[in-house]
C-alpha cells in the first residue's frame, strides 16, 4: 500500500499550503501518481468551497498534507503521516461541524474517484508528536 517514491511537489492546487520544494510521497499504486493525487485534492477542494472561513484553511492544509504526505527518502522511501495533534485540532477545533459531514460522505462513498476512496484521516490512528517528533509531520 505504501509503495512509491519521493519527488518535489510540482502541482498547483497545494502550492500555497506545502513548503516550497517540499519532498512529497508519490504513490505508485496509481498509473500517474502526480496527476492522480492532484486530482484527488481537486475533488476534495471543491467540497471545501462550502465550509466556514474558519475551517477552510485548516482543512486545506490537512488535505494537502494527507494526500501529498511528506516523504522520507532512503532505500525505501517512506511517507510521513500528519501528527495526531494537528489532525485533532482540525477535527475538533476548526472544523467540528464540517468533519461530521465529511465523515458521513466518506461512509456513503461520495468521495469515490474511480479506484480511490478519498477518506478523511482517522486522527486516532496517526502517530503522536509526543512519541517521536520525527515520526509525523506538523502542519
Amino acid at each position: 500500500d505504501n509503495k512509491g517514491y519521493c519527488a518535489q511537489y510540482r502541482g498547483e492546487v497545494c502550492n500555497a499550503v506545502l513548503a516550497k520544494d517540499a519532498l512529497v510521497f508519490l504513490n505508485t499504486s496509481y498509473a500517474d501518481p502526480e496527476e492522480a493525487q492532484e486530482l484527488l485534492v481537486h475533488t476534495a477542494w471543491n467540497e471545501l468551497k462550502v465550509v466556514s472561513p474558519v475551517c477552510r484553511p485548516a482543512a486545506e492544509a490537512l488535505l494537502c498534507n494527507h494526500i501529498f504526505q511528506e516523504c522520507s527518502p532512503g532505500v525505501v522511501p517512506t511517507p510521513i503521516p500528519i501528527c495526531r495533534e494537528y489532525c485533532l485540532a482540525v477535527k475538533e477545533l476548526f472544523c467540528a461541524k464540517e468533519w461530521l459531514v465529511m465523515e458521513e460522505k466518506t461512509h456513503r462513498g461520495l468521495y469515490r474517484s474511480e479506484m480511490h476512496l478519498l477518506s478523511v484521516p482517522e486522527c486516532s490512528k496517526l502517530p503522536s508528536m509526543h512519541w517521536d517528533p520525527t515520526a509525523c509531520a506538523r502542519l
Epitope: Y30, A31, E34, E35, A36, E38, L39, M115
Partner: antibody, heavy 119, light 112 residues
C-alpha cells in the same frame, strides 16, 4: 459530461505543416495526461504522443520524433499537436484521448480530425 | 517497444453465442503495484474507440456485464459471453505500462 473536440485537420502537401487542437471540457483538465492517437485509413490505432499535466514531461512515437511537437494550455483547457515535415504516411484520423491517472487507460476520446498529406 | 499480438484478426459470431479474443504482449504488463496495465477498446463502425476493460479485468463505466477481461503478465483474454448485434466493430488491446503505448492489430468482430 467529459468532452474532447479535435480541430485543425485538412489537406496538406508533403513537407508542409499543420497544427491540431483539442478543446476539452467537463473535467479537471490540468490533472490529466493527454495523448494523441492516430489511425491511418483502414488501419489500426497508433499512439503518437503524450504530455503530462503540469510537470512538463512528454514523449513521442519514434515515427514522429523531431517532426511533431505536443503542447497544452491549462488556462484554455486545450491540447495541441504541431506537425511539421509531414509525410504521406502521416495521413490519418488524429484522436485526442485522456489518460486516467488512476488506471492508465485512455478513458475518453474525441471524435477525431482527418489529416490528409498528398500532393 | 512492447509488441502486442492479437488473435484472431477476424471473428464471425452468431448472435447469442460466446466470443473470445486473445492478446499477448512481448513482455510482462504486471507492474510492481500488482496491476496489469492492459486495456481493451472497441471501435464501432464510424466511431471513435471506447474503453471496455482497464487493468486487465475491470469493466469501464457503462460496459455491459457480458464483457469480461482476464489474464496476467503476458497473456490476456477478452470474452463476450453472448454476442449481440451492437457488439460489431474492431477490438483492440493496448498496453499502458510504458511509452510508447502500443496496440494490438485489432480483431474485427462481425455477425454471421
Amino acid at each position: 459530461e467529459v468532452q474532447l473536440v479535435e480541430s485543425g485537420g485538412g489537406l496538406v502537401q508533403p513537407g508542409g505543416s499543420l497544427r491540431l487542437s483539442c478543446a476539452a471540457s467537463g473535467f479537471t483538465f490540468s490533472s490529466y495526461r493527454l495523448n494523441w492517437v492516430r489511425q491511418a485509413p483502414g488501419k489500426g490505432l497508433e499512439w503518437v504522443s503524450y504530455i503530462s499535466s503540469s510537470t512538463g514531461s512528454l514523449d513521442y512515437a519514434d515515427s514522429v520524433k523531431g517532426r511533431f511537437t505536443i503542447s497544452r494550455d491549462n488556462a484554455k483547457n486545450s491540447l495541441y499537436l504541431q506537425m511539421n515535415s509531414l509525410r504521406d504516411e502521416d495521413t490519418a484520423v488524429y484522436y485526442c484521448a485522456r489518460r486516467s491517472p488512476y488506471t492508465g487507460s485512455l478513458d475518453n476520446w474525441g471524435q477525431g480530425t482527418l489529416v490528409t498529406v498528398s500532393s | 517497444d512492447i509488441v502486442m499480438t492479437q488473435s484472431p484478426l477476424s471473428l464471425p459470431v452468431t448472435p447469442g453465442e460466446p466470443a473470445s479474443i486473445s492478446c499477448r504482449s512481448s513482455q510482462s504488463l504486471l507492474h510492481s503495484n500488482g496491476y496489469n496495465y492492459l486495456d481493451w477498446y472497441l471501435q464501432k463502425p464510424g466511431q471513435s474507440p471506447q474503453l471496455l476493460i482497464y487493468l486487465g479485468s475491470n469493466r469501464a463505466s457503462g460496459v455491459p456485464d457480458r464483457f469480461s477481461g482476464s489474464g496476467s503478465g503476458t497473456d490476456f483474454t477478452l470474452k463476450i459471453n453472448r454476442v449481440e448485434a451492437e457488439d460489431v466493430g474492431v477490438y483492440y488491446c493496448m498496453q499502458a505500462l510504458q511509452t510508447p503505448y502500443t496496440f494490438g492489430q485489432g480483431t474485427k468482430l462481425e455477425i454471421k
